[in-house]
Interface confidence: low
């Protein structure tokens, strides 16, 4: 068969790997792109091939399994390379064929430097542990299908360079790190390097994950308008500008989708025919609390304008919330000569 | 091909400050780690501290409070300020590239040396 | 902190001779051991990295083996210009950036 559907360049998988450490790397196709899975290709008489395209060149050329200590190898779909060199990197292609069918796809390779300390430019996972919530784990990620369940890898912890030994309330235990009770101060990057031994060489994995300390749903409320309030009264004359803002406080909660917006007379401002802007901004706390403003801006207010109702509502998993701003026409001053007068009875 | 050189030793008194450098021919310096070690006459190697360009500078415990390591990229260039100096600071100061990521961290190459001498 | 204690701390050997020294860590390091070579006045020498690889240019006649604590340098027929200072040094501990030497071997001319 000539032709071969190609899925292109997968750039939704940039794959990251540490330069000196193994990485197993399995072919996207079966996992995002067929319907069916190696086994079943296999079956059916297909065969995957690997080739690559070298960083900042064009011609694709095969990947080279005759290298000394079988350092790169093929294991069903899954490439494997015992271990990384920094010139690995480029973009990878896994084709699956017959006389009657084929399929491919590219994905990028990144092979990364770390340094004594781990920095390096690899994207970091983040987890999140709730403040002083008890017990929590984090497990050493990525390490599955590296080494036999026979073989016992020897794992060591850190948290940024440090190794993790007599902390008050972090313990390493094994693939997991167990955080006693979490504070702000747990906040930062921890690694785990885990040694293990294959074919009397001794390889190492180190992976890096950021943990946030986030608050507790154990204190989370409903969001908290704190303005507009009943304290604060927007009086304008016509002509000036009206300016409200909408303030919210939302507590952090994990996968909450934190919303705030403006009705007026009940409607959307974009149904309102008057010229209204809105602007947000958003800040965090250290515990990841959010507080949103959003500021509702008429230029040029008219007394009509001046008669609306203007609430802000807000909502998160935790519920939702509304507070109608207090917005006035400014009485003009007296004049003396004609209205004070004319006030005390005088003809 | 890659060389380093260090410039700036020189009899110093006690409490005094110096400022080592360290230029990098070749390839930008911001491809690698680079490390200060020192050698006191006699006596064995010491890592003094150790660079990562964009992204971090560790020091032995003993230096942290006295000696800053920095770069200038734009000139490939390495320092090491060293302020109140004393008489056990007396050695060879070296640069040195390490092996940035590898699990060896091995030192491939090394500068002269450069002597720094504190005494009154 | 990984401890690296070297042994013999100097030894005399003449051209010719099979000459081994041994680099002991006070916790395992796997295979992440260099050696390095210093003559009197001049920079340490990179002679073996990850405990038993030459870099380009070494003479095959240096060669390292060992792994976890116990590391050898082994020089197969010594060479006139081979009598120097000998240090290991470890870098395996990557939450310590304290690269470990080890006190130094002197070989001397019997």
């Known amino acids: 068969s000539e032709r071969c559907d190609d899925w292109g360049l997968d750039t939704m998988r940039q794959i990251q790997v540490f330069e000196d450490e193994p990485a197993r790397i399995k072919c996207p196709l079966f996992e995002h792109f067929l319907k069916f899975n190696y086994s079943t290709a296999h079956s059916a008489g297909l065969t995957l091939i690997w080739y690559w395209t070298r960083q900042d060149r064009d011609l694709e050329e095969p990947i080279n399994f005759r290298l000394p200590e079988n350092r790169i190898s093929k294991e069903k779909d899954v490439l494997w390379f015992r271990p990384t060199l920094l010139n690995d990197t480029g973009n990878y292609t896994c084709m699956l064929r017959n006389t009657t069918y084929c399929s491919k796809v590219a994905f990028p390779l990144e092979v990364v430097q770390k340094d004594s300390c781990f920095n390096s430019p690899m994207k970091l996972p983040v987890h999140k542990l709730y403040i002083e919530y008890g017990i929590q784990r984090i497990t050493c990620p990525n390490v599955d299908g590296y080494f036999p369940s026979s073989v016992k890898p020897t794992i060591t912890w850190y948290m940024g360079c440090y190794k993790i030994q007599n902390f008050n309330n972090v313990i390493p235990e094994g693939m997991n790190l167990s955080f006693l009770i979490a504070f702000i101060s747990n906040n930062g990057n921890y690694t785990c390097v885990v040694t293990y031994p294959e074919n009397g060489r001794t390889f190492h994995l180190t992976r890096t994950l950021t943990v946030k300390v986030v608050g507790s749903p154990k204190n989370a409320v409903p969001p908290v308008i704190h303005s507009p309030n009943d304290h604060v009264v927007y009086e304008k004359e016509p002509g000036e500008e009206l300016l409200i803002p909408c303030t919210v406080y939302f507590s952090f909660l994990m996968d909450s989708r934190n919303e705030v917006w403006w009705t007026i007379d009940g409607k959307k401002p974009d149904d309102i025919p008057i010229d209204v802007t809105i602007n947000e901004s958003i800040s965090h706390s250290r515990t990841e609390d959010e507080t949103r403003t959003q500021i509702l801006s008429i230029k040029k207010v008219t007394s009509e304008d001046l008669k609306r109702s203007y609430v802000c509502h807000a909502r998160s998993a935790k519920g939702e919330v509304a507070k109608a701003a207090t917005v006035k026409q400014k009485v003009p001053a007296p004049r003396y000569t004609v209205e004070l007068a004319c006030g005390f009875g005088a003809t | 091909e890659v060389q380093l050189v260090e410039s700036g030793g020189a009899l110093v008194q006690p409490g005094g400050s110096l400022r080592l450098s360290c230029i990098v021919s070749?390839?930008?310096?911001?491809?690698?780690?680079i490390t200060w070690f020192r050698q006191a006459p006699g006596k064995g190697l010491e890592w003094v501290a150790t660079?990562?360009?964009?992204?971090?500078?560790y020091y032995a415990s003993w230096a942290k409070s006295r000696f800053t390591i920095s770069t200038d990229t734009s000139k490939n260039t390495l320092f090491l300020q060293m302020d109140s100096l004393r008489a056990e600071d007396t050695a060879v100061y070296y640069c040195a590239r390490g092996g940035v990521g590898s699990s060896w961290k091995a030192f491939d190459l090394w500068g002269p040396g450069t002597l720094v001498t504190v005494s009154s | 902190d990984i401890v690296m204690t070297q042994s013999p701390s100097s030894l005399s050997a003449s051209v010719g001779d099979r000459v081994t020294i041994t680099c002991q860590a006070s916790e395992s390091i796997s295979t992440a051991l260099a050696w390095y070579q210093q003559k009197p006045g001049k920079a340490p020498k990179l002679l073996i990295y990850k405990a038993s690889t030459l870099p380009s240019g070494v003479p095959s006649r240096f060669s390292g083996s060992g792994s976890g604590t116990d590391f050898t340098l082994t020089i197969s027929s010594l060479q006139p210009e081979d009598f120097a200072t000998y240090y290991c040094q470890q870098g395996f501990s990557s939450g310590n950036v304290h690269n470990a030497f080890g006190g130094g071997t002197k070989v001397v001319i019997k």
């Open positions: 070749g390839p930008s310096l911001s491809h690698f780690d």
């Open positions: 660079i990562s360009p964009g992204v971090s500078t």
